[in-house]
Amino acid sequence: HTAAQDNCTCPTNKMTVCSPDGPGGRCQCRALGSGMAVDCSTLTSKCLLLKARMSAPKNARTLVRPSEHALVDNDGLYDPDCDPEGRFKARQCNQTSVCWCVNSVGVRRTDKGDLSLRCDELVRTHHILIDLRHRPTAGAFNHSDLDAELRRLFRERYRLHPKFVAAVHYEQPTIQIELRQNTSQKAAGDVDIGDAAYYFERDIKGESLFQGRGGLDLRVRGEPLQVERTLIYYLDEIPPKFSMKRLT
């Protein structure tokens, strides 16, 4: 199915316009901004979501890098170019003809250049580290309970098979969720770790992308897990290409 048939809405993406104009009068939903048809039984790609979000205020972040090749989303929001499948195009440019290359999660991985800049391929982000700090609780969470709950959440809410949750680390108050997904591992129909991480990030910030669902209520053995800060690191299959000037 593609959308909730009864009231013609998209359960996985509230930034859509839906109408019963699909084959046989079926409900069909299109993403705002791009007008592309989306499959409402799974997560919408991050590229289409960013495109739809462009009316929202800019929200730039600066994150600490855990290794020399880890990327963070310093550039904040931009209006991306998406391919016909909804993936980020390897080269992104703004209205002033400034261009740069991005990875599969849309994060810049080169210095900015002009229209002559070439981005030969869309480089896959195969490892995402989600770094969370939770609010103080009476005691530490049980690590295995926390691991189980986060894996359940990614499977049931974000439709990500637990085999792509490589590990859940915990040293109170820091939780790290490692998502890993090589190109060879990702089968047709598998949710992309970049999309799952983006939905999770928005949920954690209280900006849920889901239609008509309550916000994320994370509990471990009944104890609320309230996140007070989130950092996300992205590692690509091919290391990024930045000039030395940026690294100093």
Epitope: P11, S41, R152, E156, R159, K163
Partner: antibody
Framework: QVQLVQSGAEVKKPGASVKVSCKAS????????INWVRQAPGQGLEWMGV????????SYNQKFKGRVTMTRDTSTSTVYMELSSLRSEDTAVYYC????????????WGQGTLVTVSS | DIVMTQSPLSLPVTPGEPASISCRVS??????????MHWYLQKPGQSPQLLIY???NLESGVPDRFSGSGSGTDFTLKISRVEAEDVGVYYC?????????FGGGTKVEIK
């Protein structure tokens, strides 16, 4: 405590359809997907598919595609498995089983429903 | 589909003695150190029950005489001292890839 209670035994004729129910209790229904597994007399276990209780859509074993439909009713915390175009080989005990927390293991099982297909 | 091959088919045991069941998988079910392999026991006339998940984790409420080991394609279920209540059919199962598949089963019976 977590419980999965299935509907009673059924006798069907070849070509007919059967709909088996599985009522969940003791936990938040939409937090865990439900699988269906069948077991022919004296045979092993065979996975038929899984339904997301959160979204309502299902993923089926290719072997049963086109014949099996899994649905759910959140108002009654019940999952249904309908198998159509029944043949004698479909005579089996049908189990619903809940996903466990982290690794897609099946941590709770229903008591099973015997479906007999006979002319 | 991933094929699960269990051995032996039948295992006559003496109470108090150890028992071991093997499960070989046609392709690896390991993902970043997590093995999507589980063991179930189906006692006579009952539904299957989960014993071990993720190859070696004991399910809550299961006696610690049960243990699981292995990774990749070769897995083992061990019972340190078999008790009369352990009789039934033991199944291994992979949940790495759809369709999830089970081994053919090992029937454990008291000698």
């Amino acid at each position: 405590q977590v419980q999965l209670v299935q509907s009673g035994a059924e006798v069907k004729k070849p070509g007919a359809s059967v709909k088996v129910s599985c009522k969940a209790s003791g936990y938040t229904f939409t937090d865990y997907s439900i699988n269906w597994v069948r077991q022919a007399p004296g045979q092993g276990l065979e996975w038929m598919g899984v339904i997301s209780t959160y979204y309502g859509d299902a993923s089926y074993n290719q072997k049963f595609k086109g014949r099996v439909t899994m649905t759910r009713d959140t108002s009654t915390s019940t999952v249904y498995m309908e198998l159509s175009s029944l043949r004698s080989e479909d005579t089996a005990v049908y189990y619903c089983a809940r996903y466990g927390d982290g690794y897609n293991q099946f941590d709770y099982w229903g008591q099973g429903t015997l479906v007999t297909v006979s002319s | 589909d991933i094929v699960m091959t269990q051995s032996p088919l039948s295992l006559p045991v003496t109470p108090g003695e150890p028992a071991s069941i093997s499960c070989r998988v046609s392709e690896s079910v390991d993902s970043y150190g997590n093995n999507f392999m589980h063991w179930y026991l189906q006692k006579p006339g009952q539904s299957p029950q989960l014993l071990i998940y993720r190859a070696s984790n004991l399910e809550s409420g299961v006696p610690d005489r049960f243990s699981g080991s292995g990774s990749g394609t070769d897995f083992t279920l061990k019972i340190s001292r078999v008790e009369a209540e352990d009789v039934g059919v033991y199944y291994c199962q992979q949940s790495y890839e759809d369709p999830y598949t089970f081994g053919g089963g090992t029937k454990v019976e008291i000698k």
